[in-house]
Interface confidence: medium
């Protein structure tokens, strides 16, 4: 599923991401835009043999199990395929664990490079939330 900007903002708010660990909703929508272009089925392979999955591009080396990443920790205790569902519950729950891990949203490279320090509220402007 490819979400609309405001559709995703509403879904993320429903799942409790607004101000989760101090990160406003705009940060999460911005991260999703530049990680996956709002596509729940996005997959991207990394040079270390791991793969990033879903709307927030969650990595199989640490957070989920795709059955083929050497040394996978699966800290979210889920199959990576669950992160590709049109229902973003699994991605959100795992993202909450990631953002609580100490580095905050710096765990997402796209957020660090494209969203951090910018007017992230622009990503939810005009949305009826």
């Amino acid at each position: 599923k490819v979400f609309g900007r405001c559709e995703l903002a509403a879904a993320m708010k429903r799942h409790g991401l607004d101000n989760y660990r101090g990160y406003s909703l705009g940060n999460w929508v911005c991260a999703a835009k530049f990680e996956s272009n709002f596509n729940t089925q996005a997959t991207n392979r990394n040079t270390d043999g791991s793969t990033d999955y879903g709307i927030l591009q969650i990595n199989s080396r640490w957070w989920c199990n795709d059955g083929r990443t050497p040394g996978s920790r699966n800290l979210c205790n889920i199959p990576c395929s669950a992160l590709l569902s049109s229902d973003i519950t699994a991605s959100v729950n795992c993202a909450k664990k990631i953002v609580s891990d100490g580095n905050g949203m710096n765990a997402w490279v796209a957020w660090r490079n494209r969203c951090k320090g910018t007017d992230v509220q622009a990503w939810i402007r005009g949305c009826r939330l």
């Epitope: 089925q41 997959t43 040079t47 795709d66 059955g67 083929r68 395929s81």
Partner: antibody, heavy 115, light 107 residues
Framework: QVQLQESGAEVMKPGASVKISCKAT????????IEWVKQRPGHGLEWIGE????????YYNEKFKGKATFTADTSSNTAYMQLSSLTSEDSAVYYC?????????WGQGTTLTVS | DIELTQSPATLSVTPGDSVSLSCRAS??????LHWYQQKSHESPRLLIK???QSMSGIPSRFSGSGSGTDFTLSINSVETEDFGMYFC?????????FGGGTKLEIK
Amino acid sequence: QVQLQESGAEVMKPGASVKISCKATGYTFTTYWIEWVKQRPGHGLEWIGEILPGSGSTYYNEKFKGKATFTADTSSNTAYMQLSSLTSEDSAVYYCARGDGYYYYWGQGTTLTVS
Amino acid sequence: DIELTQSPATLSVTPGDSVSLSCRASQSISNNLHWYQQKSHESPRLLIKYTSQSMSGIPSRFSGSGSGTDFTLSINSVETEDFGMYFCQQSNSWPRTFGGGTKLEIK
């Protein structure tokens, strides 16, 4: 137990297309990548690409882009590979395998003859 | 693409001999190297995963070693059922690649 059952041997004319199937049983089909491998005598084993059935995400070896197309039907736990514009170079045994980095589970192979 | 070169192409041995098969990668692949045995008209069978981890049901005479670019499959005291083709495969990067194979034949 995990099993991958491939469709039977095919004899095709040059220029035609063929669709090979791989039915998976004994595990959660949507969770694991299905890989496709080509074997020709004297050419060893070649990785064609892969599909994640749960999402339809696919990756292809550059060499096989435009030649192979992967699909999956999660209702029947079956993965498919279509090969188009067949030539004699496509005559080979084609295997599906479950993608665990390594390949522990293999189909029995489908022999394709183009002549 | 990572190229895997296996040597020798053919190895002629007598049952009871011990042998070593080599697989060399064109660049470092850490320990992401797997070994398969294939007999005529059969699917490949996984012997060793991640360089040295033996699969259950595989006889203990098969062992693997190496790291980086140089890997070895050793068969301690070859038995008649061991004859066939042996392939290595890397899972360090895409596309996945296989070695050209070593044929183990009876002398």
